[in-house]
């Protein structure tokens, strides 16, 4: 198991990249002046205590920014949030911190990220550009849940 976060670049199938704007992650078309965030990804060290065959449980952070992606309920609905958190602190915890964990599933070049805390809810971006990342249960409809990962360094 890796003990160092892996920096990756993420874009969706429409070649939109993730950008941080006012502490919110949004997906925008890749252009010259756009600076996409680098995502840090690390596998949960307690993989044997999580569901098998759902994907690799990972924590997702923003490289160098001490911010991690997490899922929390707002009313009845799970929402995607950024929380100030050191990804290695999550990694080292004695139990999986499920609100910050995602099952990373790969099919060919496409990756999906399913919330561990809210099974059936996936990281998604609206089919329109310039929208915040969200969680959705609606696969392949108005939202894109398939992403491409490029390992950096």
């Amino acid at each position: 198991k890796s003990e160092m976060p892996q920096p990756v670049s993420i874009q969706d199938i429409n070649h939109r990249v993730w950008v941080l704007q006012d502490q919110i992650l949004i997906a925008v078309p890749r252009k010259d002046r756009v600076s996409p965030v680098t995502i840090s990804l690390i596998s949960c060290r307690h993989v044997e205590t999580l569901e098998k065959d759902r994907g690799n449980p990972i924590y997702l952070g923003l490289n160098g920014l001490n911010l991690c992606l997490m899922c929390a309920k707002a009313g009845d609905q799970p929402t995607l949030q950024l929380k100030e958190k050191d990804i290695m602190d999550l990694y080292n915890q004695p139990e999986p911190v499920k609100s910050f964990l995602f099952y990373h599933s790969q099919s060919g070049r496409n990756s999906t990220f399913e919330s561990v805390a809210f099974p059936g809810w996936f990281i998604a971006v609206s089919s329109e550009g310039g929208c915040p990342l969200i969680l959705t249960q609606e696969l392949g409809k108005a939202n894109t849940t398939d992403f491409g990962l490029t390992m950096l360094f």
């Epitope: 999580l50 004695p94 139990e95």
Partner: antibody, heavy 121, light 109 residues
Framework: QVQLVQSGAEVKKPGASVKVSCKAS????????IHWVRQAPGQGLEWIGR????????RYDPKFQGRATITTDTSTSTVYLEFSSLRSEDTAVYYC??????????????WGQGTLVTVSS | QAVVTQEPSLTVSPGGTVTLTCRSS?????????ANWVQQKPGQAFAGLIG???DRAPGVPARFSGSLLGGKAALTISGAQPEDEADYFC?????????FGGGTKLTVL
Amino acid sequence: QVQLVQSGAEVKKPGASVKVSCKASGFNIKDTYIHWVRQAPGQGLEWIGRIDPAIGTTRYDPKFQGRATITTDTSTSTVYLEFSSLRSEDTAVYYCARLHYFGNNFFFDYWGQGTLVTVSS
Amino acid sequence: QAVVTQEPSLTVSPGGTVTLTCRSSSGAVTTSNYANWVQQKPGQAFAGLIGGTNDRAPGVPARFSGSLLGGKAALTISGAQPEDEADYFCALWFSNHWVFGGGTKLTVL
């Protein structure tokens, strides 16, 4: 309010099994981990194991692996500890405890009232 | 398997400061042991005080603080109150299991 309510005292003969229950209220057990700990008369606490009620996966102290079985029924928010091949030295108060992530860390924050299991011939 | 040792008993005067410690037979206690401290008052259920070495549980008074002290986990009560008379137990994490200590009986006298 958060509560863990355990089943009543049990008296068992050596070699028998016992099943203790822990009913949770005031929170969703799927959002936490439930642990079992015991305290023999005049002794400290001894960790037995834990369950992730959302998934059903368990962890046990190697000392109790094979004799302790932790299960859950999420429909009733109840966690069970079954202890087999009982010996007199298993006489203890058995506690369930919630291990909950809050802020930056996990806490053994809420505990059941304890269940006395007496093993005697 | 590691053995976790605590002072069997300690006494503190009301308003005084006392430090309870938690030693591991397997070497120095570190932040990777995620020390937890729980309290049991006479006739009451256990209640969590400290997690992750030095984080106070919600609602725990500020007079309770956790730290590492000379290779041991420590719980300090500053300005002890009569209601702090209780049994205190530490728990340490070792890779895939927890080990609890034998407990400290604290008397406020």
